[in-house]
Interface confidence: low
């Protein structure tokens, strides 16, 4: 009506969408008696009565508040429960006497979008697009009002930008009242966004202030033609015989090219094509000298047909060759000399070492080894290590054993051995010598021979306890070509229940073990005992 | 929209030929490597034949090896499958699928064309 | 080269299924894995290491050790009854070869 004063503007409430709205009846005394008030609301111009205050009790009219409604504050707020966003919209108080007065409050519905998920294009981009591709999807689902989408790649935000970048954004009414938002990002993308990390974020505001919410970091598969390609050898640094060595074929393209690998013949100096699985890994497993030489790559554009060759690599695999020995079979006799030359050939320097076998002794670090007054006990085993030092664990041996000419030599020479009547015992025998001696024992029983080294072997005779055998005794003989030699093992008897625990005899290299004559398959380690005091 | 239309497939006497084609379009048809994929009545999915996606290299099945050709022309969008000296056990739907060497075998497939080989 | 497949397995509704798919090749590539119904063209459904196609619930998943693979339906719908293939490309040549799976027969009870 001109000349009335203009309508103030409407108090904001602000609340989230669930919430409970307090909207309060702002007209003062003079205005209107709260105790006589109609609540309006306004939705495109039209007021509908939404509640009646009289005599400060609240009645709900029929109709979409009915049931949300109560008054508070002694009959001065209005609350609304269970704020939807078809909440947003003016409400009015209007006092009644002395004269009819309103005051109008604009209320606000908010809430904040779930988590933004994004989904990045699974079938990637190619660089040389003409325009703008599919790169990822960001959708932000029900939020109030509609939230703002930012896109950031590399943790910078993206713009618009006429045939290079473009957000498509899209929202859509859920049947709560809520949005979702849909926000696709289309980009020309170049081989250096392989990596580039992107991602959405959400702007939206609440009573609280204004928030945001960032989607996970995705990576967009980039597809760019190869412009090189390259060979890799693993492991880097140098390579010995026996390695796992893998040639890896390696492109700056995606997808990689198909890949072949090609070894130059070192006769024909033709390149000859090696076996590689469609990786381009060629795996060399045991590595050997034969796989040194000029190897180069070749990748092949399936689309294209383009073919790229990669610079040679030369690949030198280390090796020592087999170990020789001279003499390879020594023999000498006891008081002679003898001179042992070792021979290698090796990709790099050789060091020499001699080592005696028994011990693991080092007598001589160089090729040759010199043994003078030889005496029985220098004969057995000598090793020869040929090595290359500044490549560990490239190193090849060779064993040469030395024959030094003599009668059988015992273990032991005397050894007793307690036992218990119908026993069987377990007994053994040891003798050295070369030639090398063979065993024989003094009673019947079940023997067994073994040999040990070229010079030494080992009898195991398994024999029943009879009284005759603990008058006798036993005797293992060792012979060869030049002489005999015996042991004499005496047998005492001795009652089980007085062994001692954990006490295996160890005399010698010879071992017995008793057992019941009537249970075979059940033995028992012989113990050693404390010798009676009667004994000199 | 991705598409793959086969056509092509009728009944044929052993020992004759047939062409199969399939038409593309919704994408950049010469960036994709193509194949052809069958499966006889009743039976698994047996990958018959690959071409690159210029139509220079070429692979197939041991099954069909010197008896089918595959090729394309880009300008059309259309890939092609000749087939000679057909055996009764080359009877099968036969589908074309596009294919991305390296990354992403077979993620479009068309609706597929019957094959039946039959005196 | 072969891979192999059980024939068929069955799922009770909402339960977890694991077909699974055994060949040399499944050492140096992952397998694809498709979906057909009947009458129907195959859907890809898995690819990679374990990547889904817009459009694929993620109740399909994959996993690959050795010289198996696998695709797991975790809550398993009636919809997903369907025979189901693997597929690999060949590792032993230089020429591009695929195969695919013998194939199982899914029945969602």
């Known amino acids: 009506v001109p000349g009335e004063a203009e309508q103030p503007a409407p108090e904001l409430v602000e609340v989230e969408v669930g919430s409970t709205a307090l909207l309060k009846c702002g007209l003062s005394q003079s205005q209107g008696n709260l105790s006589h008030v109609d609540w309006f609301s306004v939705h495109k111009e039209k007021r509908t009565l939404i509640f009646r205050v009289r005599q400060g009790q609240g009645q709900s009219e029929p109709g979409e508040y009915e049931q949300r409604l109560s008054l508070q504050d002694r009959g001065a707020t209005l609350a609304l429960t269970q704020v939807t966003p078809q909440d947003e919209r003016i409400f009015l108080c209007q006092g009644k006497r002395p004269r009819s007065q309103e005051y109008r409050i604009q209320l606000r519905v908010y809430k904040a979008p779930e988590e933004p998920n994004i989904q990045v294009n699974p079938l990637g981009i190619p660089v040389n697009s003409k325009e703008p591709e599919e790169v990822a999807t960001c959708v932000g689902r029900n939020g109030y009002p509609i939230p703002q989408v930012i896109w950031y790649k590399n943790g910078r935000p993206l713009k618009e930008e006429k045939n290079r970048v473009h957000i498509q954004s899209s929202q859509t009414v859920e049947s709560s009242g809520l949005y979702t938002l849909q926000s696709i990002l289309k980009a020309q993308l170049v081989k250096e966004d392989k990596d580039a990390q992107f991602y959405c974020e959400l702007n939206y505001r609440l009573p609280s202030g204004n928030h945001m919410k960032e989607s996970r970091e995705v990576t967009v598969p980039v597809f760019y033609p190869t412009e090189k390609v390259w060979l890799e050898v693993e492991p880097v640094g140098m390579l010995k015989e026996g390695d796992r060595v893998e040639i890896r074929c390696l492109a700056d393209g995606n997808p990689p090219p198909h890949f072949s690998i090609s070894k130059q013949n070192p006769s024909t100096r033709e390149a000859e094509e090696e076996t590689t699985n469609d990786n381009g890994v060629l795996v060399l497993e045991p590595a050997r000298k034969e796989h040194s030489g000029r190897y180069e790559c070749q990748g092949l554009d399936l689309d294209t047909m383009i073919s790229l060759l990669s610079e040679p690599q030369e690949l030198l695999v280390n090796y020592v060759s087999d170990v020789r020995v001279s003499p390879a079979a020594p023999e000498r006799q006891e008081g002679s000399s003898l001179t042992l030359t070792c021979e290698a050939e090796s990709s790099q320097d050789l060091e020499f070492q001699w080592l005696r076998e028994e011990t693991g002794q080092v007598l001589e670090r160089g090729p040759v080894l010199q043994l003078h007054d030889l005496k029985r006990e220098a004969g057995g085993g000598y090793r020869c290590v040929a090595s290359v030092p500044s490549i560990p664990g490239l190193n090849r041996t060779q064993l040469v054993n030395v024959a030094i000419f003599g009668p059988p030599w015992m273990a032991f020479k005397e050894r007793k051995v307690w036992v218990k009547e119908n026993m069987v015992l377990n007994l053994s025998c040891e003798a050295s010598g070369h030639p090398r001696p063979t065993i024989s024992w003094n009673v019947n029983g079940t023997a067994s021979e073994q040999d040990q080294d070229p010079q030494r072997v080992l009898s195991t005779l398994n024999v029943l306890v009879t009284p005759e055998l603990l008058e006798t005794g036993v005797e293992c003989t060792a012979s060869n070509d030049l002489g005999k030699n015996t042991s004499i093992l005496f047998l005492e008897l001795v009652n089980l229940t007085t062994l001692t625990p954990d006490s295996n005899t160890t005399t010698g290299l010879s071992t017995s073990t008793a057992s019941p004559h009537t249970r075979a398959n059940s033995t028992s380690t012989e113990r050693k005992l404390p010798e009676p005091e009667s004994r000199g | 929209e991705v598409q793959l239309v086969e056509s092509g497939g009728s009944l044929v006497q052993p020992g004759g030929s047939l062409r199969l084609s399939c038409e593309a379009s919704g994408f950049t048809f010469s960036s994709y490597a193509m194949s052809w994929v069958r499966q006889a009545p009743g039976k698994g999915l047996e990958w018959v034949s690959i071409i690159s996606g210029s139509g220079g290299s070429t692979s197939y099945a041991d099954s069909v090896k010197g008896r089918f050709t595959i090729s394309r022309d880009s300008s059309k969008n259309m890939l092609y499958l000749q087939m000679n000296s057909l055996r009764a056990e080359d009877t099968a739907v036969y589908y074309c699928?596009?294919?991305?060497?390296?990354?992403?075998?077979?993620?479009?497939w068309g609706q597929g064309t019957l094959v039946t080989v039959s005196s | 080269f072969m891979l192999t497949q059980d024939p068929a397995v069955s799922v009770a509704l909402g339960q977890t299924v694991r077909i699974t798919c055994q060949g040399d090749?499944?050492?140096?590539?992952?397998a694809s894995w498709y979906q057909q119904k009947p009458g129907q063209s195959p859907v890809l459904v898995i690819y990679g290491k374990n990547n889904r196609p817009s459009g694929i619930p993620d109740r399909f998943s994959g996993s690959s050790s050795g010289n198996t693979a696998s695709l797991t339906i975790t809550g398993a719908q009636a919809e997903d009854e369907a025979d189901y293939y693997c597929?690999?490309?060949?590792?032993?040549?230089?020429?591009?070869?695929?195969?695919f799976g013998t194939g199982t027969k899914l029945t969602v009870l």
């Open positions: 699928a596009r294919d991305k060497y390296g990354y992403n075998p077979f993620d479009y």
């Open positions: 597929n690999s490309r060949d590792s032993s040549g230089n020429h591009p070869l695929y195969v």
């Open positions: 090749s499944l050492r140096s590539y992952y």
